[in-house]
């Protein structure tokens, strides 16, 4: 017979999105048991029924992972999990409405810091995303926000910062002392959908000057 | 060298509809993010819309939105924007333009359209 | 939208003059800021990018600051060259948006 309340085998269903990377996780309720299992179905809104995912019926860990399954960029999906105990109990929980676009948050970008006698150079490497164009090439975050730029901080001592920021790849702060090291810290910004990475962090030192040797 | 090359404007009437070309080359076109600008005769610049050549993702100035649609052909480097229900205020030189290294640095020399009766 | 306004819309200069253009955005556009300049019949060139970043080629007499939401284009020498159209324009945020444009004459 069904739980009183589904919560009792199945908590917290919701997707967990980084590059577009979309992983469907639960947690157990307090009636879940290790043999518990675990078969997740999805759809994509406007759509009537549910598809059952391969490789994620009857498992017993708590994540399936969806990101081929909710690939469009333009599509707004929907997930649930049904739960069955060992003692044939079952509950079935949906997540809320998921948008790939919206819900993704971006992980700290690739960075190479470079450094030189009087300037350190930072160039950014693009983000790659599993989601696959028409022609097979996997999509950058630059290729699916328009507004995505750099943001870049050089801590040149406790009061005062150095920055810039655009769409480029490639930067340099200028005008630094020989010899000294500096932190410099990197983040993606896509102002339209609000997201902002974690920063990258590089802590480098500028090259001797051996012009005065 | 970067080259953008429109061609397709024209005298239309009101309610009419055009097709805008832009022939690309001298960049990666296919990894691209493709602009159409337009400026109404005697005034400042207008972003239309914007397409990622890879992606598909496509954006538009509201004043335009259910109207226009751009598009590309990869294969032969073309970017286009129909241009359906015109209207007076769409009378404008139509630019291509592309974003490459992240500047908005290369343009085409445009395509004179006029919306008239 | 992110609305720009730039002044004067037109300016009269001698050459050699120092000549400043503003532009201000009606929110943070952080240095996503680009200045071009147009001349009849053509399309507008990129002058600065990200608010004080020199295009290669442009010449050194070119200069852009900022300060806040408030960006200024300066010409420290007008040169007969310079009379021309200037934009700037706002790269944080669809619909990317331009000023109104400064017309530069000879005076």
């Known amino acids: 017979h069904a739980p009183e309340d589904p919560s009792d085998l199945l908590q917290h269903v919701k997707f967990q999105s980084s590059n577009f990377e979309n992983i469907l996780t639960w947690d157990s309720g307090p009636e879940g048991t290790p043999d518990t299992v675990y078969s997740i179905e999805y759809k994509t809104y406007g759509e009537r029924d549910w598809v059952a995912k391969k490789g994620c019926q009857r498992i017993t860990r708590k994540s399936c992972n969806l990101t081929v399954e909710t690939g469009n960029l333009t599509e707004l999906y929907y997930a649930r999990v049904t739960a069955v105990s060992a003692g044939g109990r079952s509950a079935t929980k949906m997540t809320d409405r998921f948008s790939s676009l919206q819900h993704t948050t971006l992980k700290p970008p690739d960075v190479t810091c470079i450094s030189k006698v009087r300037s350190i150079q930072m160039i950014v490497h693009p983000t790659p995303t599993p989601i696959r164009a028409g022609d097979g090439h996997r999509l950058t975050l630059e290729d699916i926000f328009h507004d995505l730029f750099y943001h870049l901080e050089l801590q040149v001592n406790r009061t005062y910062q150095m920055h810039l920021g655009g769409k480029q790849r490639e930067y340099e702060f200028f005008g630094l002392t020989p010899d000294t090291e500096f932190l410099g810290t990197i983040m993606i910004c896509v102002p339209t959908w609000a997201k902002e990475s974690a920063p990258y962090m590089c802590r480098v030192k500028t090259l001797p000057d051996r012009t005065w040797t | 060298e970067v080259q953008l090359v429109e061609s397709g404007g024209g005298l239309v009437q009101p309610g009419g509809s055009l097709r805008l070309s832009c022939a690309a080359s001298?960049?990666?076109?296919?990894?691209?993010?493709m602009y159409w600008v337009r400026q109404a005769p005697g005034k400042g610049l207008e972003f239309v819309s914007v397409i990622n050549t890879r992606s598909g993702i496509t954006h538009y100035v509201e004043s335009v939105k259910g109207r226009f649609t751009i598009s590309t052909d990869n294969a032969k480097n073309t970017l286009f924007l129909q241009m359906n229900s015109l209207k007076s205020e769409d009378t404008a030189v139509y630019y291509c333009a592309t974003r490459i290294q992240g500047l908005i640095d290369y343009w085409g020399q445009g395509t004179q359209v006029t919306v008239s009766s | 939208d992110i609305q720009m306004t730039q002044s004067p819309s037109s300016l009269s200069a001698s050459l050699g003059d120092r000549v400043t253009v503003t532009c201000q955005a009606s929110?943070?556009?952080?240095?996503?800021l680009n200045w071009y300049q147009q001349k009849p019949g053509q399309a507008p060139k990129l002058l600065i990018y990200?608010?004080?970043r020199l295009r290669i080629g442009v010449p050194s007499r070119f200069s852009g600051s900022a300060s806040g939401t408030s960006f200024t284009l300066t010409i420290s020498g007008v040169e007969a060259e310079d009379l021309a159209t200037y934009y700037c324009?706002?790269?944080?945020?669809?619909?990317?948006?331009f000023g109104q444009g400064t017309k530069v004459e000879l005076k």
């Open positions: 001298g960049f990666t076109f296919s990894s691209s993010w």
């Open positions: 990200g608010a004080s």
């Open positions: 929110q943070s556009i952080r240095s996503s």
């Open positions: 324009l706002q790269e944080y945020a669809w619909p990317l948006t």
